[in-house]
């Protein structure tokens, strides 16, 4: 099996996880995408998904999770707002492609949420310039009930669909060791 890699994100309660999942534009632009949590020894559980077919840059909100699919850029934006300690866990983005199994987008995300220090600047929701306001019009999409048992134990083989070259001038070395940096407040 392909070795699964993870990005680790260490945040404090009340902060926002704001990450992207890249996908191959031509192949998956309108496919339904989902955000899943993987608990030890269990199959992935879908927490939120886009509509089917996925609508361009149309926010879908499920509780504190907001998904936005930017078709023109091959980018799914995932936000988890007002994080709680119990949100800690292993997450992944997948693309639904029935009748085939979901396609996992590398890498998985290991989220560690710890108690915040009260009064710490920048640790709460109002410390940003509009960036984490929940969109006024959001849709809750119905997610397929099935999940893939295979994604619990192994990832699909890496292909050019999963990793492509940088879009511009910085030629990142050690692609497998690329820095893992979240964007959050």
């Amino acid at each position: 099996a392909t070795k699964l890699t993870e990005e680790k994100y260490e945040l404090k309660e009340g902060q926002t996880l704001d990450v992207k999942c890249d996908y191959t534009l031509e192949k998956f632009a309108s496919s339904q995408k989902a955000w899943q949590i993987i608990r030890d020894g269990e199959m992935p559980k879908t927490l939120a998904c886009t509509e089917r077919p996925s609508k361009n840059s149309h926010p879908v909100q499920v509780g504190r999770i907001i998904l936005e699919d930017y078709h023109d850029h091959g980018l799914l934006r995932v936000r988890m707002v007002n994080l709680q300690v119990e949100d800690s866990g292993l997450y992944q983005c997948v693309i639904y492609q029935p009748p085939k199994e979901p396609h996992m987008l590398f890498d998985r995300i290991r989220l560690v949420v710890t108690k915040g220090f009260s009064g710490t600047p920048g640790s709460n929701e109002n410390s940003t310039q509009n960036v984490y306001k929940i969109p006024p019009t959001t849709t809750k999409a119905l997610c397929p009930l099935y999940t893939s048992p295979r994604t619990v134990t192994q990832a699909p083989p890496k292909s050019t669909a999963d990793v492509s070259t940088p879009d511009s001038e910085i030629n990142l070395t050690n692609v497998t060791d690329i820095i893992r940096v979240p964007v959050f407040n």
């Epitope: 990005e7 260490e10 999942c21 930017y70 850029h73 990793v163 820095i179 940096v181 964007v183």
Partner: antibody, heavy 126, light 107 residues
Framework: QVQLVQSGAEVKKPGSSVKVSCKAS????????ISWVRQAPGQGLEWMGG????????DSAQKFQGRVTITADESTSTAYMELNSLRSEDTAVYYC???????????????????WGQGTTVTVSS | DIQMTQSPTSLSASVGDRVTITCRAS??????LAWYQQKPEKAPKSLIY???SLQSGVPSRFSGSGSGTDFTLTISSLQPEDFATYYC?????????FGGGTKVEIK
Amino acid sequence: QVQLVQSGAEVKKPGSSVKVSCKASGGTFSSSAISWVRQAPGQGLEWMGGIIPIFGTADSAQKFQGRVTITADESTSTAYMELNSLRSEDTAVYYCAFTPRYRGSSHHYFYALGVWGQGTTVTVSS
Amino acid sequence: DIQMTQSPTSLSASVGDRVTITCRASQGISSWLAWYQQKPEKAPKSLIYAASSLQSGVPSRFSGSGSGTDFTLTISSLQPEDFATYYCQQFNSYPLTFGGGTKVEIK
């Protein structure tokens, strides 16, 4: 190779506003990330905020909130930083910095401020 | 905000010397650290990202190490063009914060 060209030097009165532009060429602008960093004379670097143009909204350091507005125009691949209620301590060189989007294998937007503009000197003096 | 403390604030060295600059974060930042070089009247230049990955085009005499709270930038053999000010920056959380800088001067 991405290049960033910033607007020219400005001299402003206290209490006024300044808007600095940063035009990108040669790269994917919309889904990349733009940061604004300033440097007061003889001082270190200070991150003011950043924006991913396709998202339309920006994040800024708490110190500048209420005074700074960061925007981006995808059609012209130009980012802007407007600072209001200027005071003498805002005298500094203002840089824009570009983080190209890396497709695949990573989930973040900012990983390093890889390409920098030439800087715009803003002098605030009565 | 995460505070980044660099040491020393300045150092004098000769061409060929091995130079080490340290950067300490006020809380754990995993490996989310970058190093920059800045020369007088110039914009900063990216040297290292992810604590230890060399930016494309940067000479291999530059290396970075560390994780958590303690990080190091090493120049294995100082060259004349390396005399400059060096900054670390954390990318773990907003606001992205810089260290105060280390000025490397000619002895």
